[in-house]
């Protein structure tokens, strides 16, 4: 069952998926000037059995300059508005991902892949939040969100993370100040599969992270 909405936004925070539940779809998107190969897959799908999960289908891009007899179905900007976008992910993975049953690892990048990845999450998916660089966790309760099915509708749980600029807070004497987290940027949440139209999307990788991070920032 696909989740109706995107994971919730947290100001000055980013979320990441450590692994993707079976049933998750990743759109095959190509960067500007490229398109999916003729009769290429529209998406990759996380599938598997009790012992192993992997991504079905392969995304392949070819130069738009190459004329094909069959018209390629490249999403137009208007169509993109109906989809959820995430920034290009790092192929580096935490070691424990492979041991999570019923989940796929982050798919490796494909040649001429678009800078944004468009995922379609399923019920049971969990994402993890952290404050972006320059902000720190004033309060870190459960800093994750899970897509759950209740009363026939899907709903993401609310992460209890409050990120604040260094100068905005004070602490009790003796309290240790948490460190600012690596850079990352939060995701848009305006419809179930939505593009990030009203704020800038930037690509970056946090060297200290061993997993993919979503990188859409509220400027």
């Amino acid at each position: 069952e696909l989740c109706d909405d995107d994971p919730p936004e947290i100001p000055h925070a980013t979320f990441k998926a450590m692994a993707y539940k079976e049933g998750t779809m990743l759109n095959c998107e190509c960067k500007r000037g490229f398109r999916r190969i003729k009769s290429g897959s529209l998406y990759m799908l996380c599938t598997g059995n009790s012992s192993h999960s992997s991504w079905d289908n392969q995304c392949q891009c070819t130069s738009s300059a190459t004329r094909n007899t069959t018209k390629q179905v490249t999403p137009q900007p208007e169509e993109q508005k109906e989809r959820k976008t995430t920034e290009m992910q790092s192929p580096m993975q935490p070691v424990d991902q492979a041991s999570l049953p019923g989940h796929c690892r982050e798919p490796p990048p494909w040649e001429n892949e678009a800078t944004e990845r468009i995922y379609h999450f399923v019920v049971g998916q969990m994402v993890y939040y952290q404050c972006v660089q320059g902000y720190r966790a004033l309060h870190r309760g459960p800093a994750e969100s899970v897509c759950k099915m209740t009363h026939g509708k899907t709903r993401w749980t609310q992460p209890q993370l409050i990120c604040t600029g260094e100068m905005e807070t004070s602490q009790f004497p003796g309290e240790e100040k948490p460190q600012a987290s690596p850079e990352g940027r939060p995701e848009s949440e305006t419809s179930c599969l939505v593009t990030t139209t009203d704020f800038q999307i930037q690509t970056e990788m946090a060297a200290t992270m061993e997993t993919s991070i979503f990188t859409t920032e509220y400027q």
């Epitope: 004033l138 309060h139 409050i162 309290e175 305006t190 509220y218």
Partner: antibody, heavy 115, light 107 residues
Framework: QVQLQQSGAELVRPGVSVKISCKGS????????MHWVKQSHAKSLEWIGV????????SYNQKFKGKATMTVDKSSSTAYMELARLTSEDSAIYYC????????WGQGTSLTVSS | DIQMTQTPASLSASVGETVTITCRAS??????LEWFQQKQGKSPQLLVY???TLAEGVPSRFSVSGSGTQFSLKINSLQPEDFGSYYC?????????FGGGTKLEIK
Amino acid sequence: QVQLQQSGAELVRPGVSVKISCKGSGYTFTDYAMHWVKQSHAKSLEWIGVISTYSGDVSYNQKFKGKATMTVDKSSSTAYMELARLTSEDSAIYYCARGVTFDSWGQGTSLTVSS
Amino acid sequence: DIQMTQTPASLSASVGETVTITCRASENIYSFLEWFQQKQGKSPQLLVYNAKTLAEGVPSRFSVSGSGTQFSLKINSLQPEDFGSYYCQHHYGIPYTFGGGTKLEIK
């Protein structure tokens, strides 16, 4: 079920301080930050500040710095707010509310400052 | 500080009618907005969080729209229990601020 139980109404003289409490129950207290909100006839609802129930870290609305001091006692699952140097302007109802989205509120503590 | 401007400040309506309350932020707050309902002598109660998600137990006659700087709360087919005050509030950066409120009264 989730409950935030606040201390009772206070009638105090100008110039003194008062400390009001908010006890959380029915959930893991340290999972949710605690906010304090002032409601007066003149100003509707005003956010005073927030305290991490886990670390004691605090952040205040600039307007209430020096006026309000928020603390927390994890062992009793209670958040406190002390209001100093009280004047008639501080007469209001004060609420505690939990979490990122203020999903549960205390019943309010009425504070009257009068000579 | 981000200013939240609510309109109208008050309105009268009859049971069964539809009303809309709007909230405007002085700058982009994305979807970091909550709506609260407060009945006379009671605490505020969360109605909507993150601009578009109805809180647990909130009837479907309540609907919301907007993101960025313009938001609205619509109540279809007003019920007697819907009368009271409504507030919007942002949680995009400190200090959080509330709208001035909208008092919904029975006509």
